[in-house]
């Protein structure tokens, strides 16, 4: 019972995590304009892995894709690659883990095969989660470096009195979604690996012992006791609920009530 629960929970947690990784990868708010010095701005900039957006205070939002591969920073390309690898591994892991679930019977699949598949999917989830966490962390590090660089030369004088304010970027919502999602996928993977140990059949074979009673003989043949009794072949009336993640991207935000500028 505990093994099945651990496996099922690992699957659901990983599913939510991978949905989150996909959501984070698609989100536009990887970096958002720093509003520390100016909480109410007439033009708000934010950037994702695939496009950059500008939201005007009039409500008009314009997004432009990065229509170049060679012209993009190597770090951004690396982050994209890490996130895509994470998604692909996670998706394959999900596919494998569906067939590995103890509560699902597919033909006459051996427990040892399910154990191997559970371990495989677990490892895939762990690597997927690590890829997402690494991708998000690399991007965050890039932001921090650029933030302090732009702070150092925040104002560049032009002809004495004229100032050009450099736009600084800080952590966007996608980074937090990515970190949490990566963590969930990682936890799900660990749970799958733990479940795998419980799924592996015991090697110990017990010899049949015959007890002779007076009048008639009854043979007792102890077998390998399964912790997950009741979750073997009977799959009738069983529902498998899968989790999902939802992101609220491109939500229109406006200057808060009674802002004075």
């Amino acid at each position: 019972m505990a093994v099945t629960a651990c496996q099922g929970l690992g699957f659901v947690v990983s599913l939510i995590g991978i949905a989150g990784i996909i959501a984070a990868t698609c989100m536009d708010q990887w970096s958002t304009q720093d509003l520390y010095n100016n909480p109410v701005t007439a033009v708000f900039n934010y950037q994702g892995l695939w496009r950059s957006c500008v939201r005007e205070s009039s409500g008009f939002t314009e997004c432009r894709g990065y229509f170049t591969l060679l012209g993009l920073p190597a770090m951004l390309q690396a982050v994209r690659a890490l996130m895509i690898v994470g998604i692909v591994l996670g998706a394959i892991g999900l596919l494998v883990s569906i067939f590995a679930l103890k509560c699902i019977r597919i033909g006459s699949m051996e427990d040892s095969a399910k154990a191997n598949m559970t371990l495989t999917s677990g490892i895939m989830f762990i690597v997927s989660g690590l890829c997402a966490i690494a991708g998000v962390s690399v991007f965050a590090n890039m932001l921090v470096t650029n933030f302090w660089m732009s702070t150092a030369n925040m104002y560049t004088g032009m002809g004495g009195m004229v100032q050009t304010v450099q736009t600084r970027y800080t952590f966007g919502a996608a980074l937090f979604v990515g970190w949490v999602a990566g963590g969930l996928t990682l936890i799900g993977g660990v749970m799958m690996c733990i479940a795998c140990r419980g799924l592996a059949p015991e090697e110990t074979n017990y010899k049949a012992v015959s007890y002779h009673a007076s009048g008639h003989s009854v043979a007792y043949k102890p077998g390998g006791f399964k912790a997950s009794t009741g979750f073997g072949s009977n799959t009738k009336n069983k529902k498998i609920y899968d989790g999902g993640a939802r992101t609220e991207d491109e939500v229109q935000s406006y200057p808060s009530k009674h802002d004075y500028v």
Epitope: S57, S58, G59
Partner: antibody
Framework: QVQLVQSGAEVKKPGASVKVSCKAS????????MNWVRQAPGQGLEWIGQ????????TYNGKFKGRVTMTADKSTSTVYMELSSLRSEDTAVYYC???????????WGQGTLVTVSS | DIVMTQSPDSLAVSLGERATISCKSS????????????LTWYQQKPGQPPKLLIY???TRESGVPDRFSGSGSGIDFTLTISSVQAEDVAVYYC?????????FGQGTKLEIK
């Protein structure tokens, strides 16, 4: 077609308050910010603030801090601008203007002359 | 606040001639995110509210004659009327649309010689 119709001229005494209305028609009222701009006689334009009728959010020019209040009535598609503690230098034509892309103001009301005189 | 300075204060040109109005801002109006300049031009005829001519420094509003054009980037901007017509007699204002509070230039009065 888009139309912004403002209330009539007002004469007020110093220290009093004035409430100017702007009735919008011909577009989705709740989806556009509305700006208020004033123009003193023979002078240039001065931005007072803006309101988003959809949720009542406002952004005001710090110069008018504590003196200006903007409200919106979605049922009548009307925005209001109230200016309190009036001074003689508040004598101006007050305009409402719809806010569009480019942070520009494309349609303007006909203007409301507010005269502050003792 | 961003200070907008227009020059000249008034301008007299003959019909059919080119008119050029300059606008300078105390801070760059160029947004790095979309490489657009948040500068707007308005025309105000006597006794009328202002009329939007150009936004994003160079994008003409629909219905505005193509003799009106805007140019410039960063802090220096220009409104050009390629061939002045009698109906162009008005006061022209530039506006900072990049940063709150929105500020206007003092205006340039265009007259016919």
């Amino acid at each position: 077609q888009v139309q912004l119709v403002q209330s009539g001229a007002e004469v007020k005494k110093p220290g009093a308050s004035v409430k100017v209305s702007c009735k919008a028609s011909g577009y989705a009222f709740s989806s556009y910010w509305m700006n208020w701009v004033r123009q003193a006689p023979g002078q240039g334009l001065e931005w007072i603030g803006q309101i988003y009728p959809g949720n009542g959010d406002t952004t005001y020019n710090g110069k008018f801090k504590g003196r200006v209040t903007m409200t919106a009535d979605k049922s009548t598609s009307t925005v209001y601008m109230e200016l309190s503690s009036l001074r003689s230098e508040d004598t101006a034509v007050y305009y409402c203007a719809r806010f569009v892309k480019g942070n520009a103001m494309d349609y303007w009301g006909q203007g409301t002359l507010v005269t502050v005189s003792s | 606040d961003i200070v907008m300075t227009q020059s000249p204060d008034s301008l007299a040109v003959s019909l059919g001639e080119r008119a050029t109005i300059s606008c300078k801002s105390s801070q760059s109006l160029l947004n790095s995110g979309n490489q657009k300049n948040y500068l707007t031009w308005y025309q105000q005829k006597p006794g009328q509210p202002p009329k939007l001519l150009i936004y994003w420094a160079s994008t003409r509003e629909s219905g505005v004659p193509d003799r009106f054009s805007g140019s410039g980037s960063g802090i220096d901007f220009t409104l050009t009327i390629s061939s002045v017509q009698a109906e162009d007699v008005a006061v022209y204002y530039c506006q900072n649309a990049y940063s709150y509070p929105f500020t206007f230039g003092q205006g340039t009065k265009l007259e016919i010689k």
